[in-house]
């Protein structure tokens, strides 16, 4: 239903969100500024020589539930967090690693540089 | 209904300071962001920045950085605009505007007017 | 800045005619969510502007079905089907996609 004098189409919000963005900003963001019909959000995940890589920005309307819902992929190590209760409220997250899993260690602690994604296909 | 309340006109000395405010009424004040336009007599529209009311989280046009102040105050539903150190060029109508994905409604103006 | 480029500045018409006014942007106003938050503003002599058209076509509530918008990317256009004596003031399109949001010139629709 509409109210307060709304008149967009039915949205989640009644307003745009604004949030900070690195390594990913789009082509409308001013000074690491992103705005949205959606969400704010931090991600960490790693690159493909193992570093944690910290990227934020916006996440639209259509499908950020899904995306937001950090469903776990396999063979890659990633974490997101989502927040829309103010503006750049993702400079607020810190999401973290998920934890290795046994595959990933070879020869005690040490974190292969790269996943080899053939160990998981026998 | 969506009303934005405006005073009709300031008339203020070159150098000085004035406060324009903005009384919002028919919504829910937080739910919007308040955005402040200019327009000079015969030319077009300029906006200034906005504010959003639920965090006082600014953006403001380049242009006016260090000649506007946007604030609110929740608890009478008003926004407020601060021009600092006025000159001639200053002068124009002021409208205030409530902002969701675009402007819906205008306040009725402030014409400012510097003069000595 | 995105610079907003509308034409004509002026359009005499008749009572009754159709009035087209175009809107050209410096760049595109599709967002990164995928809408183009480009808007259609009415302004009568002596009152503050009213919002016509929201997100390229969209009518605001109470507005007449004889304004149409249409357009996409960067170049958009206001139909007055048949234009009333109501209609008369200065049209000014706006971009809300791009900080710092920016207006065209004005165009002034006026009696022949």
């Known amino acids: 239903k509409k109210e307060d004098g709304e008149s967009t189409a039915p949205t989640a919000r009644p307003k745009v969100l604004r949030c900070k963005c690195h390594h990913h900003c789009p082509e409308d963001s001013v000074n690491n500024i992103c705005s949205t019909d959606g969400y704010c959000f931090t991600m960490i995940e790693e690159d493909d020589s193992g570093t944690p890589v910290v990227t934020s920005g916006c996440l639209g309307l259509e499908g950020s539930d899904f995306q937001c819902r950090d469903t776990p992929i396999p063979h890659q190590r990633r974490s997101i967090e989502c927040c829309t209760e103010r503006n750049e409220c993702n400079k607020d997250l810190h999401p973290t690693l998920p934890p290795l899993k046994d595959r990933d260690f070879v020869d005690g602690p040490i974190h292969h540089k790269h996943h080899h994604h053939h160990h998981h296909h026998h | 209904q969506v009303q934005l309340l405006q005073p009709g006109a300031e008339l203020v000395k070159p150098g000085s300071s004035v406060k324009v405010s903005c009384k919002a009424s028919?919504?829910?004040?937080?739910?919007?962001?308040m955005q402040w336009v200019k327009q000079r007599p015969g030319q077009g529209l300029e906006w200034i920045g906005e504010?959003?009311?639920?965090?006082?989280?600014?953006l403001y046009n380049q242009k006016f950085k260090g000649k506007a102040t946007l604030t609110v105050d929740t608890s009478s539903s008003t926004a407020y605009m601060q021009l600092s150190s006025l000159t001639s060029e200053d002068s124009a109508v002021y409208y205030c505007?409530?902002?969701?994905?675009?402007?819906?409604?205008w306040g009725q103006g402030t014409t400012l007017t510097v003069s000595s | 800045d995105v610079v907003m480029t509308q034409t004509p500045l002026s359009l005499p018409v008749s009572l009754g005619d159709q009035a087209s006014i175009s809107c050209r942007s410096s760049?595109?106003?599709?967002?990164?969510?995928?809408?183009?938050?480009f808007h259609w503003y009415l302004q009568k002599p002596g009152q503050s502007p009213e919002l016509l058209i929201y997100?390229?076509?969209n009518r605001f509530s109470g507005v007449p079905d004889r304004f149409r918008g249409s357009g996409s990317g960067t170049d958009f256009t206001l139909k007055i089907s048949r234009v009333e004596a109501e209609d008369l003031g200065v049209y000014f399109c706006s971009q809300s996609t791009h900080v710092p949001f920016t207006f065209g010139s004005g165009t002034k629709l006026e009696i022949k």
């Open positions: 504010i959003d009311p639920s965090d006082t989280y600014t």
């Open positions: 997100k390229v076509s």
């Open positions: 028919g919504y829910t004040f937080t739910n919007y962001w």
């Open positions: 505007a409530r902002f969701g994905y675009y402007v819906d409604y």
């Open positions: 760049q595109s106003l599709v967002h990164s969510t995928g809408n183009t938050y």
